[in-house]
Interface confidence: medium
């Protein structure tokens, strides 16, 4: 476009800027070691240090590990972002009794209101159930909290919570069958055997039934409870949440009890091929500064279960310089892929191929 020439010319001779044809404007060139936070940075504050996956840039400008939510009594509330840690909270049916930075050190099961009492305030991830005396017209046999919610005044006794600790856990607090064993497992989290991290564990075809809170006789408030990184689908089956562990993806919404995690392309990339709750193929914004572009290579490792599709090269983009070396500095046009998990096989010898689910749980790979 001839009308763009004056704008383009203003970039030439200014080593701190380059011209971006896609947005038709001058962009600030991030110094070596810094990464653009947007497609066309305008000023130094639009550049930042880049951290590896599962790390975030803290206030002191250091890459710091995001907290993990791998204990089975925790779920991810907000994902690990470039400038903030992952946040964990107690999973449904539990509340936090001892908080920790971005997480909870100790979760307890929501208590069940005893006979003659009804739920005034249902338990949340932060607070236990609050009970109050039942109205005279309400039958004490009405055990289901959902069916017993009637406004009433009076004192509000706090029901005694069921702690998640070896001393107080008991199998009677919830059904124990299938692969879940949540009552005992939740109890064992603080004393877990060193080589059995909760994020790498038992494949389970039947995750079992667990209530949102311990389920009294006659209660309708029992739903199937899935293991971490699984959700209850419309058919009532525990289904693995999608994984955003490919590093051209970021988590948009976390894995919840009734909905999958959703992934989207990370900043600086757009989705070329969509997939359920995710993107099968992210490509960099189609912009290139000829002197700084690295042509993305195909990632093809045929014997692995998770295979990142090849990244498309963009129009008007020059390939890597003759020697093929990627420079140690970055430019606004390079993809934001860091350490993407295209290959996910456990470092253990097995006779059958073993792959990892989004949780890192081994699953036999039939293919």
């Amino acid at each position: 476009f001839p009308q763009d020439r004056p704008f383009e010319d203003t970039c030439h001779g200014n080593p701190s800027h380059y011209y971006d044809k896609a947005v038709r404007r001058c962009c600030y060139r991030c110094p070596m070691g810094l990464f653009p936070t947007q497609q066309c940075p305008q000023r130094p504050t639009d550049c930042r240090k880049q951290c590896e996956p599962d790390y975030y840039l803290d206030e002191a400008d250091r890459c710091t590990a995001c907290v993990t939510c791998s204990r089975d009594d925790l779920v991810e509330k907000t994902p690990c972002a470039w400038n903030s840690s992952r946040v964990c909270e107690c999973r449904p049916g539990m509340f936090c009794s001892t908080s920790a930075v971005n997480s909870c050190a100790r979760c307890f099961f929501h208590s069940v209101c005893p006979a003659g009492m009804i739920v005034k305030f249902p338990g949340t991830a932060q607070k236990n159930t609050v009970c109050e005396p039942a109205s005279p017209g309400v039958s004490p046999a009405c055990a289901s909290p959902e069916n017993c919610k009637e406004p009433s005044s009076g004192t509000i006794p706090q029901a005694k919570p069921t702690p998640v600790s070896p001393a107080t856990s008991s199998a009677s607090t919830m059904p124990v069958r299938g692969g879940t064993r949540l009552a005992q497992e939740a109890a064992s989290k603080l004393t877990r055997a060193p080589d059995s991290p909760s994020s790498v564990g038992r494949p389970s075809s039947d995750p079992g039934l667990s209530p949102t809170q311990p389920c009294p006789e006659g209660s309708g408030d029992c739903r199937k409870q899935c293991e971490p990184d699984y959700y209850l689908d419309e058919a009532g089956r525990c289904t693995a949440c999608v994984s955003c562990s490919r590093d051209d993806l970021v988590e948009k919404t976390p894995c919840a009890w009734n909905s999958s995690r959703t992934c989207e392309c990370r900043p600086g990339m757009i989705c070329a091929t969509s997939a359920t709750n995710s993107c099968a193929r992210c490509v960099p914004y189609p912009i290139c500064a000829a002197e700084t572009v690295t042509k993305p290579q195909d990632m093809a490792e045929k014997d692995t279960t998770f295979e990142a599709p090849p990244l498309g090269t963009q129009p008007d983009c020059n390939p890597t310089p003759e020697n093929g070396e990627a420079p140690a500095s970055t430019s606004p046009t390079q993809s934001l892929l860091v350490d993407s998990q295209a290959s996910k096989t456990l470092p253990i010898p097995t006779s059958a191929p073993v792959a990892l689910s989004s949780t890192g749980k081994p699953v036999l790979d039939a293919g």
């Epitope: 590990a65 990632m299 970055t330 290959s343 890192g360």
Partner: antibody, heavy 123, light 107 residues
Framework: EVQLQESGGGLVQPGGSLRLSCAAS????????IHWVRQAPGKGLEWVSY????????DYNQNFKGRFTTSANKSKNTAYLQMNSLRAEDTAVYYC????????????????WGQGTLVTVSS | DIELTQSPSSLSASVGDRVTITCKAS??????VAWYQQKPGKAPKVLIY???YRYSGVPSRFSGSGSGTDFTLTISSLQPEDFATYYC?????????FGQGTKLEIK
């Protein structure tokens, strides 16, 4: 099988330069960051730098920023550590290592290491 | 930078002994600590990650514990092949740092 092999070490005079190579095999090179860790004779381990072969992004221990530069050649599955203005105290075995991919979280501990290459800075 | 201080710097023990090595961080590192074993002329080998999780193939006599600032590597019953130097590493915050090492020698 994941394998990392360093080369390029040797004797160099103070103020001189050297480029170390780390040839990777057994995994998709662009999938993992490659780190450099060094160990002076009879001393402990010291993290130097890492390179993301996919984007070319690097980060450094402040002690080495400016003198050391990491790069990668994706077509050769090789990472490099360019060391300039070498001093006697840079004498060490230099290892390249690959970060973990284990379980749900991807943190930077090292299950895979090369055998190391010795760099001696002496006049 | 986060400093890791290992103690003792060296110790002598016999086959069958129970040995404990500690690693103290200068600030909270959560459970983001790994332990390595290194033999002369060889690269380090990871034993423990996330403070207490044994890496695949590591014998069960090795165990790790701790969180925050204090971490421990325990070898429950020393075997001849365990005589080596042990390092802790924090991967909580960059730059990544290692302890100065603990040399385990035969008594």
């Amino acid at each position: 099988e994941v394998q990392l092999q360093e080369s390029g070490g040797g004797l160099v005079q103070p103020g001189g330069s050297l480029r170390l190579s780390c040839a990777a095999s057994g995994f998709t090179f662009t999938t993992y960051t490659i780190h450099w860790v060094r160990q002076a004779p009879g001393k402990g381990l010291e993290w130097v730098s890492y390179i993301n072969p996919s984007s070319g992004y690097s980060d450094y221990n402040q002690n080495f920023k400016g003198r050391f530069t990491t790069s990668a050649n994706k077509s050769k599955n090789t990472a490099y550590l360019q060391m300039n203005s070498l001093r006697a105290e840079d004498t060490a075995v230099y290892y390249c290592a690959r970060r973990a991919d284990y379980g749900n979280y991807k943190y930077t501990w090292f299950p895979y290491w090369g055998q190391g290459t010795l760099v001696t800075v002496s006049s | 930078d986060i400093e890791l201080t290992q103690s003792p710097s060296s110790l002598s023990a016999s086959v069958g002994d129970r040995v404990t090595i500690t690693c103290k961080a200068s600030q909270n590192v959560g459970t983001n600590v790994a332990w390595y074993q290194q033999k002369p002329g060889k690269a380090p080998k990871v034993l423990i990650y996330s403070a207490s999780y044994r890496y695949s193939g590591v014998p069960s006599r090795f165990s790790g514990s701790g969180s925050g600032t204090d971490f421990t590597l325990t070898i429950s019953s020393l075997q001849p092949e365990d005589f080596a130097t042990y390092y802790c590493q924090q991967y909580h915050t960059y730059p990544l740092t290692f302890g100065q090492g603990t040399k385990l020698e035969i008594k």
